[in-house]
Amino acid sequence: QPPPPPPDATCHQVRSFFQRLQPGLKWVPETPVPGSDLQVCLPKGPTCCSRKMEEKYQLTARLNMEQLLQSASMELKFLIIQNAAVFQEAFEIVVRHAKNYTNAMFKNNYPSLTPQAFEFVGEFFTDVSLYILGSDINVDDMVNELFDSLFPVIYTQLMNPGLPDSALDINECLRGARRDLKVFGNFPKLIMTQVSKSLQVTRIFLQALNLGIEVINTTDHLKFSKDCGRMLTRMWYCSYCQGLMMVKPCGGYCNVVMQGCMAGVVEIDKYWREYILSLEELVNGMYRIYDMENVLLGLFSTIHDSIQYVQKNAGKLTTTIGKLCAHSQQRQYRSAYYPEDLFIDKKVLKVAHVEHEETLSSRRRELIQKLKSFISFYSALPGYICSHSPVAENDTLCWNGQELVERYSQKAARNGMKNQFNLHELKMKGPEPVVSQIIDKLKHINQLLRTMSMPKGRVLDKNLDEEGFESGDCGDDEDECIGGSGDGMIKVKNQLRFLAELAYDLDVDDAPGNSQQATPKDNEISTFHNLGNVHSPLK
């Protein structure tokens, strides 16, 4: 039987609706027309649509779809962007405090070394920061350079303070002797192992977060195909051509269309799931020597121990070096005056005991829990978008792309669409090139995360004792002792409580040798304001 004529025989409602999309009415017929030129909203009778209107509907449908997609990912995108920024800044703050602790240790214990030691320590921690941010620096080289630089100063200032100026040309030989004679024992290797493991994990953690942002940004800005535009137009706008302004698309029909449009995007799902689970595995392994906070904030203590090791063997070393470096090659000795305060940046912090203590590690776990709630994000996208766009409840009295139906039947809808274009074909085209690229990047980061993760990959799990070191860990109880003994040493109770709004309630007694109190810069605190309901100790 022929379809009922449009309720509005003058296309008046259609005209007023279309005016909102496109000012001016030149494209809208005043009364229903045959519509033989239509390509999407194929009429079964007179229609209030023209070819130009159809094109406008297609454009609008694709824009709507892009907006829906962006709003669907907004929460997830914000979660990752915010955390990537927070962690990056927190890591930089850890590095700065580690540098301050180390400088303060030198100032307290070895004041005669400070000018040069501050310089070498500064260079080392600058390299640490650069490495975390992805710079192509070798961690072993960084550690070697630190100790190569320190030893000539230790030798000439501590072990042989009476050396005549003419003897200062042995610098290059002393640098070489540092390794050849193993003057610091196994401490440099211990530091290499701990620093490289913890920084590797930190770096890949940040890389993974930044890739997460890239994934969302990519899918956020996808341009949908013309085929998809036609399907969306048929679902959202073709009913208007028949004057059915208030009719909503059938829910089942919406799901079919969205799955067609999203076929490429949904292919990300498998790799996205793996990404979140691999990231969780990595985070679960970020403790002790895999936790840069723990490792870097304890470095000052290990460096102190290494210098004590040199001092303990000073007698034998001095004789051996006399033999090794007699008449050695000359090298200009870089001596410069460094003001005492130049390298301690007066923000050595007290460990804050806060009611709701929040460490970097708890913040990481919290992030993973939130990310896990988005594990089905991509597979759920079609359903999400349908639930956030107007669809008829229970699939009753709804639009199936061709007509108003009492109940939606997927089979009937598919049959009706066959002559227009093939849904199956749309799915088989495969993902967009940008989606393929992002899938490749996800595969790569997943591979890296798997390699780094401790339970499976075991790349990072060599026990230090195996490598001939004293492990230096103080047992498995909650309080990790990462400070050493001796003057100016501190114990950091269960790591720094950074994220308690970066509690810089400075107390000189708790810091290794800082002589002034300081207030943090405002911007260092503001980044962390949204990190949880924490009672800040800041006055």
């Epitope: 030989c173 002797a177 090659q329 490598e467 001939g468």
Partner: antibody, heavy 120, light 107 residues
């Protein structure tokens, strides 16, 4: 690339002397010491001594003190090792080797070896 | 006078791991270097400063050093790894000392 090229094989009578040369290329000759190491047929490696091309400073193994002399010519980037009062048990392949850092360093590049045969 | 003791020979199947030890009094306090020597060739440095690898040496070669024993480990052994291996240290009393050497045979 770093290369150490040694002089050819030599046959000497007991009591005589032998002088082996080692020409270096591919790096700054003065900035690395040169060690001499020998290996008797079917035996292990034995260190003879070290010389700094920069200073001419030498360090000889106790066993060879008084019998060995090492020298360098920086203008030709060549090191020399002379062994005197040769005995039949000095028959060996003699290698020059570059020290990585100081006298106490490992040897990161080696010459191809020079066979010295001591026979009456 | 330092003495470095190595096992005379080690046999290993291809793809397996070979471990060569070098024993010496308190060797852990010294830097140990390892050389590979194939018949008719000069030695080649494969590991230095206990565990560092020169460029061009495969990651399969690794070293460790602790207490009175240093170890050269060759993982996923290949036929081309068949050679003599020597450890070496320097100490102030006896200068450079080489180990007795170990012949590695790939089965």
């Amino acid at each position: 690339q770093v290369q150490l090229v040694q002089s050819g094989a030599d046959v000497r009578k007991p009591g005589a002397s032998v002088k082996v040369s080692c020409k270096a290329s591919g790096y700054t000759f003065a900035s690395h010491g040169i060690s001499w190491v020998r290996q008797a047929p079917g035996q292990g490696l034995e260190w003879l001594g070290w010389i700094s091309p920069y200073t001419g400073n030498t360090n000889y193994a106790q066993k060879f003190q008084g019998r060995v002399t090492m020298a360098t010519d920086t203008s030709t980037s060549t090191a020399y090792m002379e062994l005197r009062s040769l005995r039949s048990d000095d028959t060996a392949i003699y290698y020059c080797a570059r020290g990585k850092r100081t006298l106490a360093s490992c040897f990161d590049y080696w010459g191809q070896g020079t066979l010295v045969t001591v026979s009456s | 006078q330092s003495v470095l003791t190595q096992p005379p020979s080690v046999s290993v199947a291809p793809g397996k791991t070979a471990r060569i030890t070098c024993g010496g009094n308190n060797i852990g306090s010294k830097s140990v270097h390892w050389y590979q020597q194939k018949p008719g060739q000069a030695p080649v440095l494969v590991v230095y400063d206990d565990s560092d690898r020169p460029s061009g040496i495969p990651e399969r070669f690794s070293g460790s050093n602790s207490g009175n024993t240093a170890t050269l480990t060759i993982s996923r052994v290949e036929a081309g790894d068949e050679a003599d291996y020597y450890c070496q240290v320097w100490d102030s009393s006896s200068d450079h000392v080489f180990g007795t050497g170990t012949k590695v045979t790939v089965l």
